[in-house]
Interface confidence: medium
């Protein structure tokens, strides 16, 4: 004689105002867990929204965006515009990265390019609105005598090939 | 926590009799599954009626009960069960559960001319 | 309306022993709605089981409940002269009319 309604299993709600106890969940709704006593109406993927996952007695529709746009927040409950590498998205749509600035992603913000000179190194690849500077060695350890972090390879006698 | 019912009592056959279970250390104003079961002397257990407390739901009652016999909550500690022409197969112990885990000692209806 | 069968009565056992009550429903109980019940002469029913299978709260894990669909058993191993009962079981339906219904209920001797 346990409470009936703890008892309805997912997929179905407790509705003790009919024949049935434990109804089964109408279309385009859901219940994920037992003693439900209602059933959730099915997110609907529309617009920029796509399926991912077909909603289920048991189970939600899962959405996915429509190509040009990304997912933002849990269970991708936006989608943003897609920017190109080398933009990013602002109130006015895209715009190009400032000087200085990257985004080797179709979303997010331009971040600034890594400082060299902070870590006391140098650029050895410039940056561009899509990529970050690369940082070489520091001038210090291009300088005649420096020590090397790799030892020379050995001198080879004439005559020998290599092995 | 515990039930105990009252009510019980000899009656003549056709008469009416109400049963009331009152719950202590606990009340009905938060949902409960409470039932009304029953035992003829030497016999087994017979389900009558269920309620949820706290809940415009509709009782559920054995086919036998339904129209004889009415289960309502009727304050935030008790529930009744209202019994109407009264036959003496209807002699037995009544009892009061909640949850099926929480049982009253039962009270003894007699019916007899 | 449902029917539940169980084990006719008495089914005698040792101290120590094992004993196994049957319960059959005339239909298929509702999402495991079937739990059985220990009374002893005199008191109100107790619940062991519930669910077919999850043990009641406080209830000794000598009792074991399995079963599905429309066949269930009570087992009751290392057999105690407490156990001397009689042992129901009920089955809940899908339905507000009938929704429950008792097993006549089996007789355990302890010797």
């Known amino acids: 004689l346990q409470d009936l309604c703890s008892n309805c299993p997912a997929g179905t709600f407790c509705d003790n105002n009919r024949s049935q106890i434990c109804s089964p969940c109408p279309p385009n709704s859901f219940s994920s867990a037992g003693g439900q006593r209602t059933c959730d109406i099915c997110r609907q993927c529309k617009g920029v929204f796509k399926t991912r996952k077909e909603c289920s007695s048991t189970s939600n529709a899962e959405c996915d965006c429509i190509s040009g746009y990304h997912c933002l927040g849990a269970e991708c409950s936006m989608c943003e515009q897609d920017c190109k590498q080398g933009q990013e998205l602002t109130k006015k749509g895209c715009k190009d990265c400032c000087f200085g600035t990257f985004n080797d992603q179709k979303r997010g913000i331009c971040r600034p390019w890594t400082n060299c000179s902070l870590d006391g190194k140098s650029v050895l690849v410039n940056g561009t609105k899509e990529r970050d500077v690369v940082c070489g060695p520091s001038p210090a350890d291009l300088s005649p005598g420096a020590s090397s972090a790799t030892p020379p390879a050995p001198a080879r006698e004439p005559g020998h090939s290599p092995q | 926590q515990s039930l105990e019912e009252s009510g019980g009592d000899l009656v003549k056959p056709g008469a009416s009799l109400t049963l009331t279970c009152t719950a202590s250390?606990?009340?009905?104003?938060?949902?409960?599954?409470m039932c009304w079961v029953r035992q003829a002397p030497g016999e087994g257990l017979e389900w009558i009626a269920c309620?949820?407390?706290?809940?415009?739901?509709?009782p559920h009652y054995a086919s036998w009960a339904k129209g004889r016999f009415t289960i309502s909550q009727t304050s935030s500690t008790t529930v009744t069960l209202q019994m109407t022409s009264l036959t003496a197969a209807d002699t037995a112990t009544y009892f009061c559960?909640?949850?099926?885990?929480?049982w009253g000692p039962g009270t003894l209806v007699t019916v007899s001319s | 309306a449902q029917v539940l069968t169980q084990t006719a009565s008495p089914v005698s056992a040792a101290v120590g022993g094992t004993v196994t009550i049957n319960c059959q429903s005339s239909?298929?109980?509702?999402?495991?709605?079937l739990s059985w019940y220990q009374q002893k002469p005199g008191q109100p029913p107790k619940r062991l089981i519930y669910?077919?299978?999850t043990l009641a709260s406080g209830v000794p894990s000598r009792f074991k409940g399995s079963g599905s669909g429309t066949q269930f058993t009570l087992t009751i191993s290392d057999l105690e002269c407490d156990d001397a009962a009689t042992y129901y079981c009920?089955?809940?339906?899908?339905?507000?009319?009938?929704?429950?219904?008792f097993g006549r209920g089996t007789e355990v001797e302890v010797k």
């Open positions: 559960s909640s949850e099926g885990n929480l």
């Open positions: 250390g606990f009340s009905f104003s938060s949902r409960h599954y």
């Open positions: 309620i949820y407390t706290g809940s415009s739901g509709t």
């Open positions: 239909q298929s109980v509702y999402s495991n709605w």
């Open positions: 669910s077919a299978s």
């Open positions: 009920a089955g809940g339906y899908n339905t507000v009319t009938d929704t429950f219904a």
